[in-house]
């Protein structure tokens, strides 16, 4: 007795065809592409029926639905909107994702996906994983360079990326990324092993006001060539943060110098220091201050601090220096790990380049000059801690 | 995101039925990309499908459970439920509600215990 | 019913590769999925469709299957990836759950 004639499900075909399928014939369902083997709702890898002696076929028989991508991820600091049409997430959709204009900017891709056959959203260069909403970097109400100890006070924005570090000592650091803090090895080290006790606040102007971002520490990374105690050459950390700031005209990571950043930071060239530490009458600064000082001359600097007590070889190549030969402009204590910022003038954006680190014991001393972690040198070590963690 | 919360009675007494809700948020309940199942782990054991819902009610149910189980949903709360007869101290476990697409099962809600004991 | 076999446990140093069998029979022919579930926690699906990875799920999670056994295997192991996995298939439409492998992490 034969079993009745197989007719293939929408968009899929039987194989093979044969005039009549009599006992122990058999015939498989092939899919169109862009279409899925369904039994209800279960995938089936292949389909397979074997006709049986009572002339039915083994099994009922399948669907071919279209694969559907399903609805697709959300994207931190970003959206997705449907092209093909409200909600459509079959074969051949397409969706557009997009950052939150003016802090995030769109990387690895345009941010257009289709729905491939595999059931995955693939982008244009197929790549299955979201795009990265990266925050844009070095935003800021400040836009002159040109005309903390002898500064002034800092307006809303203009520092966005400032952060301070509450733990053991009053310090400083900068924001990189949505979830990182530069900063100088000296003013973490002693949290190093206890990452978790440094209170970490942005996003505010007033050093003691309780309006402010706060955020923890999940790891602190200490430049390896850093030795406490002899020296601050390598004086440079990160702390990773245990959850991503959101980024807003108040809280704006600062950019990492460029290869071609050193071309801002030539001898007499101004940079800025922002920070809460001393001002002038000896006191920690309530408000965020800032001074616009330029770089000296690394020999010059180096000559300054060769006398007694500053040991030889105090300054080294991973150091730069900045200040008035006058004195009067300066970082002082509670500024450690801020950053000096530079403009660069190409792309509008404001880069690190000096890490707040030493100085004279008398803050804005004449004939002395602030000391800082030359944080193009480190590059490469920032980068890699970023990656690997 | 779509998440799902069991709640219901931590307590049922042998013999009798035992009951449990998945609220879903974040998500329809009548998207027809899914399933909605049901799982549950005894303390210290593997894991155990009970059965999946379709949100127009089509159900699919574990053979060695089926005689006692009953799956339900209902779309204006966005909740779909469980109801497991004549319990005995084997049934004591952990219940978890999941979306089931195509077979799979993500997200779990964060399951709720059941212990059966007079 | 149909049955699906894992080893109890297995150990693995970090920086390894851990790979868990689910063995059944004609498993091959059925798709496979795989669940990672830390103690206390729900379970998360780390592989669906043998060897399709969701998003969000690390890249050193991988999947096969063919003949009679499928595997989950992990390169690069790290401390985090210490939990109990269990495999999963659907037979005759209904699910079925391996016993669950615990893998342990050295170190």
């Known amino acids: 007795q034969p079993c009745p004639y197989p007719m293939a499900p929408p968009n899929g075909h039987v194989s093979p065809v044969q005039a009549k399928y009599i006992l122990k014939d058999s015939f498989s369902i092939f899919c169109e592409t862009g279409y899925e083997l369904l039994q209800g709702h279960l995938p089936l890898k292949s389909f397979t029926a074997v006709c049986q002696k009572d002339g039915s076929w083994d099994r009922p028989m399948p669907a071919c639905s279209i694969v559907d991508c399903g609805p697709p991820d959300d994207l931190p600091s970003g959206r997705v909107e449907y092209i093909t049409g409200p909600g459509v997430t079959t074969y051949k959709a397409v969706i557009q994702y997009s950052c939150e204009e003016t802090f995030y900017t769109m990387k690895v891709n345009d941010g257009k996906y289709v729905c491939e056959a595999d059931g995955f959203w693939t982008s244009s260069k197929g790549e299955k994983s979201l795009p990265v909403c990266e925050p844009v970097c070095g935003l800021s109400a400040k836009t002159t360079g040109g005309r903390i100890y002898g500064g002034q006070k800092a307006k809303p924005g203009d520092f966005p990326w400032q952060v301070l570090i509450l733990g053991g000592t009053t310090a400083a650091g900068a924001l990189l990324y949505d979830n990182w803090v530069l900063t100088a090895a000296h003013a973490v080290y002693e949290q190093k092993h206890d990452a978790s006790a440094l209170d970490i606040r942005m996003g505010t102007l007033k050093r003691l006001s309780p309006h402010y971002t706060q955020a923890w520490s999940e790891a602190v990374f200490i430049h390896e060539g850093y030795t406490h105690d002899a020296g601050f050459d390598n004086d440079i950390a990160l702390i990773k943060l245990n959850n991503k700031v959101v980024i807003n005209s108040n809280i704006t990571p600062i950019c990492l110098p460029r290869k071609e950043a050193e071309s801002f930071m030539r001898t007499d060239d101004i940079g800025t220091a922002s920070g809460w530490g001393l001002t002038q009458r000896g006191f920690l600064a309530r408000n965020l201050m800032y001074v616009d000082i330029p770089i000296v001359d690394h020999q010059k600097c180096t000559a300054a601090y060769e006398k007694p007590p500053y040991p030889r070889g105090s300054v080294t190549a991973n150091m730069l220096c900045a200040g008035l030969e006058s004195g009067g402009k300066d970082a002082c204590r509670g500024d450690s790990g801020g950053a000096l910022v530079f403009l660069d003038s190409e792309t509008e954006r404001w880069f690190v380049g000096g890490i707040v680190s030493w100085g004279s014991m008398n803050c804005g001393e004449a004939g002395q000059y602030g000391v800082y972690t030359k944080v193009i040198n480190y590059i490469p070590w920032i980068e890699n801690i970023i990656s690997d963690f | 995101q779509v998440q799902l919360q069991e709640s219901g009675p931590g307590l049922v007494k042998p013999s009798e039925t035992l009951s449990l809700t998945c609220t879903v948020s974040?998500?329809?309940?009548?998207?027809?990309?899914?399933?909605w199942g049901w799982i549950r782990q005894p303390p210290g054991k593997g894991l155990e499908w009970i059965g999946s819902?379709?949100?127009?009610?089509?159900?699919y149910y574990n053979p060695s459970l089926k005689s006692r189980v009953t799956i339900s949903v209902d779309t204006s709360k966005n909740q779909f439920s469980l109801k497991l007869s004549s319990v005995t101290a084997a049934d004591t476990a952990v219940y978890y509600c999941?979306?089931?697409?195509?077979?799979?099962?993500?997200?779990w809600g964060q399951g709720t215990m059941v212990t059966v004991s007079s | 019913s149909y049955e699906l076999m894992q080893p109890p446990s297995m150990s693995v140093s970090p920086g390894q590769t851990a790979s868990i069998t689910c063995s059944g029979d004609?498993?091959?022919?059925?798709?496979a999925y795989w669940y990672q579930q830390k103690p206390g926690q729900s379970p998360v699906l780390v592989i669906y469709?043998?060897?399709k990875r969701p998003s969000g799920i690390p890249e050193r999670f991988s999947g096969s299957n063919s003949g009679n056994t499928a595997t989950l295997t992990i390169s690069g192991t790290q401390a985090m990836d210490e939990a109990d996995y269990y495999c999963?298939?659907?037979?005759?439409?209904?699910?079925?759950f391996g016993g669950g492998t615990k893998l342990t992490v050295l170190g």
């Open positions: 004609k498993l091959g022919d059925i798709y």
């Open positions: 469709q043998d060897n």
């Open positions: 999941a979306r089931d697409r195509r077979g799979r099962f993500d997200p």
């Open positions: 974040g998500g329809s309940i009548s998207s027809s990309s899914y399933y």
């Open positions: 999963q298939a659907w037979e005759s439409s209904t699910g079925v």
């Open positions: 819902i379709y949100y127009s009610g089509s159900t």
